[in-house]
Interface confidence: low
């Protein structure tokens, strides 16, 4: 590994400077991909901080970065202005470059922060040169809050500093007023004042009246040694701006600002919600904003003014929708620091927060909404609706874009078409069936979180209030009695005050549900059944002929019945009775009542009937009594617990 580049970075005071390949350039003899050339920050900066443009600039200190990120200009050094003035300051970063299997290389990056540098974002070379605001025809003191060259003094070692001063020479005088030092006017014959006089509050600007045009003066500032001797050191030539304002002027009042929200890489207009002021005596075009500091997640642009960034704009630009924020690929939120002025009052600081939204959200549907049949309603939970993006979105909002067919969504017991994730989490959002003709329903919602939306369909099903037999296998070729030990909707009957009805939707695959003749005198054999009631179950009038699977060797099998259960005043529900079957075993105690057993298993006690070739059970015995298996009637009774 080898390290090229100057390993020095020059930074303007209080600014952000990207590390570049000129500053830091690693290479390896193996021609390693820059993504694999890794820098570790062994000792971070003391006068500022190192951070990644694409990551949260307020978070943890940067620990690792790659050469590729340096090439991309994503590794930034930010100088933090100290409270004490300085002319030049030096910072160092200790880095360790690694790219296995090569040996690590230690590197020191020197950072020079200097007012000497030409800085676009800090055009003055002085600690402060902010300009002055003065009412028309009046006077105002120019203090070190507005003009301060104490950073030039800071270039002198502190023991000698008290013997030095900064001499200001006015090279162009104000045209609409006068400068006075200790009440004496400055003029071409006496164009000087000192930093010490500034600090003592002795410099005054007196406006001559006759209008509110801009004024100012140009000056040269340099160090002055003991007894007024000129000394080598930093110097600068600059202008000091003086804004004259109408004495009757009412300053603009900034209004509360709503953060701008947009997705990565998109653009969005900035409206009065983000930037507005109340100023009765200024037109929107007269209220000017200037960007003091921009975030790293994008820039402001003016529509009709090309695509590039702008640093100055007016309230008129905002009001007409011409100002937009263009987001780059960063996912980090940021803040614009702005100054706002109506051209007559001192500038006021303002800020514009920009939230970068997820480019997509997902509505997670973990399970359909199950409505208990007897209740006919159920609360939605996070199981049904939850929004995630790059994180969970607890502040998601939902809007119904396709309502349910057979019910309503309720909040506070009243129909609603909009609700929040918070309301879901609190169990306040309820689905209630209002039309009891379907066992299922669905509705479509549009979820909105941090400005991004996604739609989803929530399915609703009714959970049957039905007790279903869950015992061991049933004998193939037998007919068993369907009674409340197998299917029981008695609780539903009690809750609804009605006789529940069943409709066979599907199955069984091998066998059939039949109605059993009431007595020997009742004509005909068993009848195929598609509908029955709870009363039929309780009367023992139903049988399930358990068939044998065709075309395969005898053995255990599975089968099921799918039923729709209806009752008065509640939605119907679909339920299934799943059961296992096996070849009939006379020695096995079956825990259901058998109305007949396979022909081969019958004794003389039962009237022989022929079995169907397919293995379906033969016709029922004409007696409602169960058929007697081998081993006698008593053993059959005992085995089947038949009563």
């Amino acid at each position: 590994l080898s390290l090229k580049g100057s390993q020095t970075l020059t930074v303007c005071p209080g600014s952000v400077q990207p590390l570049s390949s000129q500053t830091l350039r690693a290479s390896s003899s193996a021609g390693t991909d820059p993504q694999l050339l890794l820098y570790r920050v062994v000792r971070g900066p003391q006068l500022g901080r190192l951070f990644h443009a694409q990551q949260d600039s307020t978070g943890e200190a940067l620990v690792n970065f790659t050469q590729a990120e340096v090439y991309a200009g994503n590794i930034l050094y930010e100088h933090e202005m100290p409270p004490e003035p300085f002319w030049e300051a030096h910072d160092t970063l200790e880095l360790q470059l690694s790219s296995p299997p090569a040996r690590d290389v230690a590197a020191t990056l020197a950072v020079a922060v200097s007012f000497e540098a030409a800085c676009p974002q800090h055009p003055s070379h002085l600690w402060k040169n902010k300009g002055l605001w003065v009412p028309e025809g009046q006077r105002a003191r120019i203090t070190v809050a507005a003009l301060d060259a104490s950073n030039l003094l800071a270039s002198v070692p502190s023991p000698q500093r008290s013997e030095h001063d900064v001499l200001f020479q006015v090279t162009q005088f104000p045209s609409r007023g006068q400068l006075l030092v200790s009440e004496e006017p400055l003029h071409a014959g006496q164009p000087h004042f000192l930093q010490s006089q500034l600090a003592a509050g002795q410099l005054v600007y007196a406006h001559g009246g006759g209008g509110t045009q801009q004024d100012g003066f140009h000056f040269r500032a340099h160090l002055q040694g003991p007894a007024g001797a000129s000394v080598a050191g930093p110097q600068t030539s600059e202008a000091f701006a003086i804004t004259v304002r109408d004495v009757n002027e009412r300053p603009p009042q900034p209004q509360a600002s709503v953060p701008l929200r947009l997705t990565r890489g998109s653009r969005a207009p900035i409206s009065r919600a983000q930037l507005s002021v109340v100023d009765p005596d200024s037109a929107p075009g007269e209220i000017e904003y200037e960007v003091q500091r921009a975030p790293h997640n994008g820039f402001l642009s003016l529509v009709g003014g090309g695509l590039g960034p702008v640093t100055r704009f007016t309230q008129a630009d905002v009001d007409s929708g011409r100002l937009a924020f263009v987001a780059n690929g960063s996912s980090v939120a940021g803040i614009f620091q702005l100054s706002m002025s109506d051209g007559a009052s001192p500038p006021l600081p303002m800020s514009l927060a920009v939230d970068i939204l997820p480019s997509a959200i997902e509505v997670q549907l973990r399970a359909p909404l199950e409505v208990p049949q007897a209740l006919g309603r159920s609360s939605l939970s996070q199981q049904q609706l939850r929004v995630v993006s790059d994180r969970e979105e607890p502040e998601a909002a939902y809007r119904l874009i396709q309502g349910p067919q057979y019910g309503h969504l309720l909040v506070g017991g009243r129909p609603t078409s909009a609700f929040s994730q918070f309301q879901i989490d609190q169990g306040e959002v309820v689905f209630a069936f209002t039309n009891f003709s379907s066992s299922h329903d669905h509705f479509r919602v549009l979820a909105l979180a941090r400005g991004v939306n996604a739609s989803a369909v929530v399915n609703v099903t009714v959970r049957a209030l039905l007790h279903v037999w869950a015992g061991g296998p049933w004998p193939q070729g037998a007919t068993l009695r369907l009674d409340p030990t197998v299917l029981d909707a008695g609780e539903l009957a009690n809750r609804t005050g009605s006789v529940p009805r069943f409709r066979l939707l599907e199955g069984p695959r091998h066998g059939r549900v039949v109605r059993v003749p009431r007595a020997r005198t009742e004509p005909g054999g068993s009848q195929l059944v598609e509908q029955f009631t709870q009363q039929d179950l309780e009367d023992g009038r139903l049988g399930l002929e358990v068939g044998r699977p065709e075309g395969r060797a005898p053995g255990p099998a599975g089968d099921s019945l799918t039923l729709e259960l209806w009752a008065q005043g509640v939605p119907p529900a679909v339920a299934s009775l799943d059961f296992a079957t096996e070849p009939y075993n006379a020695a096995r105690p079956y825990s259901v009542a058998l109305l007949s057993v396979p022909e081969a298993a019958r004794t003389e006690a039962g009237k022989p009937e022929s079995s169907t070739p397919t293995g379906e059970p033969g016709p029922m015995a004409s007696s409602p009594e169960p058929a007697v298996a081998k081993g006698g009637f008593l053993s059959f009774l005992e085995a089947n617990m038949f009563s």
Epitope: P269, V303, G304, G305, G308, A316, G321
Partner: antibody
């Protein structure tokens, strides 16, 4: 690159409504900012008629405001101009533009 | 409405000449000014936006300057394809308005 193409009748009778459509290709109408209509009377300068923004807001030239409607159809990536109660003074080449890019213009003559 | 006044209304120049067109706004428009070039039978083309920013694909011989109410379009060395009519347009205040145009002809 965004391209714009005006379409509509070249001849409109006085007192009727002039209707033009601008089809945007190479970009989405919801991505741009301002979709403008501008006209140029024969041998004369340019006059801004109005715009519709990417989010559907309008602004019109006050001199034409009472007669102008600009609308959009995002599904077709088009925006339209309707100018009612036309007179011979509305005879002009009508351009659709986002200022960076312009359509080639279409001449509309108002005559009976 | 803001009135935009261009001068001169027309000028004759030769290939290679330096040409300057001025545009004056009836009130301050800061830097919210575009310049367009239009050739006969064609749509205007954006040359310069925001007073001095060159639109993509526009030759560097075109430049713009000014602020407030007075603006200038300069063609440093006139080329045969530059003979056309030039318009300024303000977008500081609605309604957006254009200058009446300056026709640059061959001397």
């Amino acid at each position: 690159q965004v391209q714009l193409q005006e379409s509509g009748p070249g001849l409109v009778k006085p007192s009727q409504t002039l209707s033009l459509t601008c089809t945007v290709s190479g970009g989405s109408i919801t991505d741009g900012y301002y979709w403008n209509w501008i006209r140029q009377h024969p041998g004369k300068g340019l006059e801004w008629i109005g715009y519709i923004t990417f989010d559907g807001r309008n602004n019109y030239n006050p001199s034409l405001k009472s007669r102008v409607t600009i609308s959009r159809d995002t599904s077709k990536n088009q925006f339209s101009l309707k100018l009612s109660s036309v007179t011979a003074a509305d005879t002009a080449v009508y351009y659709c533009a986002d200022f960076d890019y312009w359509g080639q213009g279409t001449l509309v003559t108002v005559s009976s | 409405d803001i009135q935009m006044t261009q001068s001169p209304s027309s000028l004759s120049a030769s290939v290679g000449d330096r040409v300057t067109i001025t545009c004056r706004a009836s009130q301050g428009i800061r830097n919210y000014l575009n310049w367009y070039q239009q050739k006969p039978g064609k749509a205007p083309k954006l040359l310069i936006y925001y007073t001095s920013s060159l639109h993509s694909g526009v030759p560097s011989r075109f430049s713009g300057s000014g602020s407030g109410t007075d603006f200038t379009l300069t063609i440093s060395s006139l080329q045969p394809e530059d003979f056309a009519t030039y318009y300024c347009q303000q977008y500081s205040k609605l309604p957006w308005t254009f200058g009446q145009g300056t026709k640059v002809e061959i001397k």
